[in-house]
């Protein structure tokens, strides 16, 4: 079956000089489009017909998915985190086999005291979330644990988390040096063996808005870029207005092509415009209209 769609057009001239028709208003021109079954041949760039309209894939939009969007939604996480794998040796508790069983009363009591102690140690670190014991073993008690850090996402989140991990190292080194046994007695909440303190590994959330932007822009990856507004990243093409990288098309319309952003210059009743940015206006010669 054939579908007849009325479309209005206005004359636009690309900056290279060719005249292009784009949808506008007023003059109706019939356009025929063949529809085979429920598959609309008009859906371009991987779009598919849902029975009513074309469903377009990022970064395309439009009736036929032929146009490229000016901005792509990228969603950085609300928060980002780091996990530090640490080992400390507690000397104020003697190891017993029950400590290996995470559901035992021994483990629960040890976990409670150890958590309280670490909460005191790291109390000045705003990124500090808590500790999680992963393993307890003989020697007196060797405590393998994770220190969890979290912060709000900002463009500088890596620096913030890197700084926090450094402070964690300083604080755990300090407490395990200062809180030590005297004559087999500990007067602190917990005592440590100074030499048993080790940082095994640090894992930081990896989020790169530039990478997400490039991936979603697909074949237009070279022309989309990330700009920040109120610490939030935006994935934009030069056709998106209001950013530092925005292209000013003056008397024209910005359009993305596989060669990048270009200006399609308008022709009005009195002028036609040309130039890369459609900023060169030429006045049309006057002629009389007969009514």
């Amino acid at each position: 079956p054939l579908a007849t769609i009325p479309v209005s057009t206005t004359s636009l001239t690309s900056s290279e000089g060719s005249t292009i028709s784009t949808p506008s208003v007023d003059i109706s021109t019939p356009v025929t489009t063949s529809i085979v079954g429920d598959q609309c041949s008009r859906c371009k760039n991987g779009g598919f017909w849902d029975g009513l309209k074309c469903q377009c894939l990022t970064p395309y939009y439009g009736e036929s998915c032929e146009e490229v969007v000016n901005s792509i939604d990228i969603a950085p996480p609300e928060t980002v985190s780091a996990q530090m794998e640490l080992t400390v040796t507690v000397t104020s508790v003697k190891f017993t086999d029950e400590l290996k069983n995470h559901s035992s009363q021994e483990f629960r009591e040890f976990n409670k005291t150890f958590t309280e102690q670490m909460n005191i140690v790291y109390s000045g670190i705003p990124e500090y979330v808590g500790v999680n014991i992963t393993n307890l073993r003989l020697g007196s008690v060797v405590v393998e644990h994770d220190v969890l850090l979290r912060t709000k996402y900002t463009p500088e989140y890596k620096t913030a988390l890197d700084n926090a991990t450094e402070v964690v190292k300083q604080k755990i080194t300090k407490v395990t040096t200062e809180q030590i046994m005297t004559n087999d007695n500990c007067s602190a909440l917990m005592c440590f063996n100074t030499t048993g303190t080790q940082v095994q590994n640090i894992t930081v959330t990896q989020y790169d808005p530039v990478e997400e932007c490039r991936q979603k822009a697909e074949e237009y990856e070279d022309y989309f870029l990330v700009e920040y507004r109120d610490q939030k990243p935006y994935c934009i093409s030069p056709c998106e207005s209001g950013f530092n990288a925005s292209k000013n098309c003056n008397h024209g319309k910005c359009q993305m092509s596989q060669n990048g952003a270009r200006c399609l210059c308008v022709t009005t009743e009195t002028h036609w415009y040309s130039g890369e940015d459609c900023n060169q206006g030429t006045q049309k010669s006057h002629h009389h209209h007969h009514h």
């Epitope: 017993t96 021994e106 007067s187 005592c191």
Partner: nanobody, 123 residues
Framework: EVQLQASGGGSVQAGGSLRVSCAAS????????WGWFRQRPGKEREAVAL???????FYADSVKGRFTISQDNTKNTLYLQMISLRPEDTAMYYC?????????????????WGQGTQVTVSS
Amino acid sequence: EVQLQASGGGSVQAGGSLRVSCAASGDTFSRGSWGWFRQRPGKEREAVALISSDGWTFYADSVKGRFTISQDNTKNTLYLQMISLRPEDTAMYYCAASVLVLRTLNPKAWHHWGQGTQVTVSS
């Protein structure tokens, strides 16, 4: 879960003796650590005498030679024998326990507490 009940406190003249007791309910009496702490008016709670299941014991310097900690596993009871009592021994005495084999004098590391028994020594 360990529950502790202290008793045996009272008033005594300087140089006198007292034995305070702490009855424990629960099946954990044979393992872990047990101790006596005291709190004098306006002061922090302090360790007096502590014992662990591996044989470790601690006595505060001020009570050495005068106080003895002991336990009777058959009765699930902890004792503190106090002789040659001094006015400065006047305090509320608390028994404490942990299922952990502890070496710490810090009361915050001890998870189970009795309600306390008052000892008053007058000159």
